[in-house]
């Protein structure tokens, strides 16, 4: 139940409270406020201080993780006196019960899998639940399809990523009838967790002196244009001695993705395969199917 934040607090306390769903820290407003400030300190003594207008009695923390425990602090000055109040936000529950080894990846442009492991001290009846909030915090996505291990949720599959933004907050809560279960939370960038498909429509056409490789950029979850891709071509002569170096060629993305290389007839049997990456991160996709060209008697 939300109270009216504009009410005047008793002189002794600011009545600081935190809503983890909205990441909003609020306190009772003081008459004739001249200065107010809110911040949090994490276990590593890092301080996060959001911007705050003087007349506000709340502040919102945008990009924070809470599972290690944080301390919120509010300082308010009025024309009469100053107020300070701390609010501890611990990760209550038994140590070691939270989900661990949490990771997510986006694949096939519109699917996402998240996986985690049961906490080492979690009881047998533990159950985990995943919630995702986008950076705009407008909506919360509950996991629609859980991956289970002996009845315990250890992963989640999403086939609708429309609610995600470029940066998202992931929260894994836990429940048990026996003990309190700690939560785990994480902030992930979609650009860093997307695994590209290999390039498609790979073709090779040769004339007497050259071969031209063409391909199409992979479809991706992120809205990218051709220069946002980097490619690697593996041109490989068949039936060579083991340990012979493959020719790896780096090619920048272009409007028409192509690579032309000298290869004169008679041409030995070769294969070519291509992989793609985000030019910023170089997280390579798997290789495309190998395309063969040339002849055995070349």
């Amino acid at each position: 139940e939300k109270s009216d934040l504009r009410t005047v607090a008793p002189a002794s306390s600011l009545n600081v409270r935190f809503d983890s769903r909205t990441m909003n820290l609020s306190w009772d407003c003081q008459e004739n406020t001249t200065f107010s400030k809110c911040f949090l300190t994490d276990k590593k003594n890092r301080v996060v201080e959001p911007r705050l207008s003087n007349n506000e009695c709340s502040c919102t923390f945008r990009e924070i993780c809470l599972h290690e425990g944080v301390t919120f602090e509010v300082h308010v000055n009025t024309s009469q006196r100053g107020f300070q109040q701390k609010l501890l936000y611990p990760n209550s529950g038994r140590e070691g019960t939270a989900a661990q080894n949490f990771s997510c990846f986006i694949y096939n442009a519109d699917l996402m899998n998240c996986t985690w492991a049961r906490g080492p001290t979690a009881p047998r009846d533990v159950q985990y639940f995943l919630y995702i909030r986008n950076s705009k915090r407008r909506r919360e996505i509950r996991c629609p399809y859980y991956i289970q291990d002996s009845g315990t949720h250890v992963g989640c599959h999403l086939d609708n990523l429309s609610g995600l933004t470029s940066r998202n907050y992931f929260l894994v809560n836990g429940t048990s009838r026996e003990i309190g279960i700690q939560f785990f939370d994480s902030l992930l960038d979609t650009k860093k967790i997307e695994r590209f498909n290999p390039p498609s429509n790979v073709t090779v056409r040769c004339n007497t002196t050259h071969c031209l490789v063409r391909w199409k950029q992979p479809r991706t979850y992120q809205k990218l244009s051709y220069l946002d891709f980097q490619y690697q071509l593996d041109v490989h002569r068949k039936n060579t001695q083991p340990g012979t170096e493959n020719l790896l060629i780096n090619v920048s993305g272009d409007l028409e993705n192509r690579y032309n290389f000298p290869s004169s007839e008679p041409r030995a049997k070769h294969s070519v395969k291509i992989r793609a990456a985000d030019v910023r991160i170089l997280n390579w996709s798997s290789w495309s199917e190998a395309i063969e060209f040339g002849s055995d008697d070349g």
Partner: antibody, heavy 120, light 111 residues
């Protein structure tokens, strides 16, 4: 090879409107993000707006909001820029270009430019 | 007044190395947003030379290189040639203006 062919030079009176076209050949307009940038001797290059793939819509620079309209006719692979309520300081070369990188907002492939002169 | 500041001109003899600076602020280059560089030969449209701070589109010679540090970026041209004589512009997104901005341009003269 992709080419952006722009319409010819225009001379307009203050208060009038101008419509500049940009015909894409060698590639389908529906697969591209077209942006408009103008260049003046005094202000240099000014980005005016264009199709933002992340927003999935045409976005405009604040300073031209209300005066500029960008449209596309994908059936003839042509993009259009209309600037209304023209003033003398709108005298510039207007370029269409392709957004080659969404993440860097880099413009690759440019038209040759359309000179628009606003004079009474 | 351009949001990104460049020197108005630099010059060098053929074969020399010249660098062009581009100074921004915490709302653009330092935010950090990526920097692109363009070359504009006299009477022609700009040509993209560098994007993502240091990547070259295919067809741009490796004599052109770029880097970025803090709130500024720089473009280097090694082995300067007569046909490098042109205007060079940097570009970056600016979160305060909420749009992409260009530098005022630097004229490179080959002596």
């Amino acid at each position: 090879q992709v080419q952006l062919v722009q319409s010819g030079a225009e001379v307009k009176k203050p208060g009038a409107s101008v419509k500049v076209s940009c015909k894409i050949s060698g590639h389908s307009l529906s697969e591209l993000s077209i942006h408009w940038v103008r260049q003046t001797p005094t202000k240099g290059f000014e980005w005016m707006g264009g199709f933002d793939p992340e927003e999935n819509e045409i976005v405009y620079a604040q300073r031209f909001q209300g005066r500029v309209t960008m449209t596309e006719d994908t059936s003839i692979d042509t993009a259009y820029l209309t600037l209304s309520s023209l003033r003398s300081d709108d005298t510039a070369v207007y370029y269409c270009s392709i957004l080659g990188s969404v993440t860097a907002w880099a413009f690759d492939y440019w038209g040759k430019g359309t000179m628009v002169t606003v004079s009474s | 007044q351009a949001v990104l500041t460049q020197p108005s001109s630099v010059s060098g003899a053929p074969g020399q190395r010249v660098t062009i600076s581009c100074t921004g602020s915490g709302s653009n280059i330092g935010a950090p947003y990526d920097v692109s560089w363009y070359q504009q030969l006299p009477g022609t449209a700009p040509k993209l030379l560098i994007y993502h701070n240091n990547k070259r589109p295919s067809g741009v010679p490796d004599r052109f290189s770029a880097s970025k540090s803090g709130t500024s970026a720089s473009l280097a041209i090694t082995g300067l040639q007569a046909d490098d004589e042109a205007d060079y512009y940097c570009q970056s997104y600016d979160s305060e203006d909420r749009m992409t901005e260009f530098g005022g341009g630097t004229k490179v003269t080959v002596l």
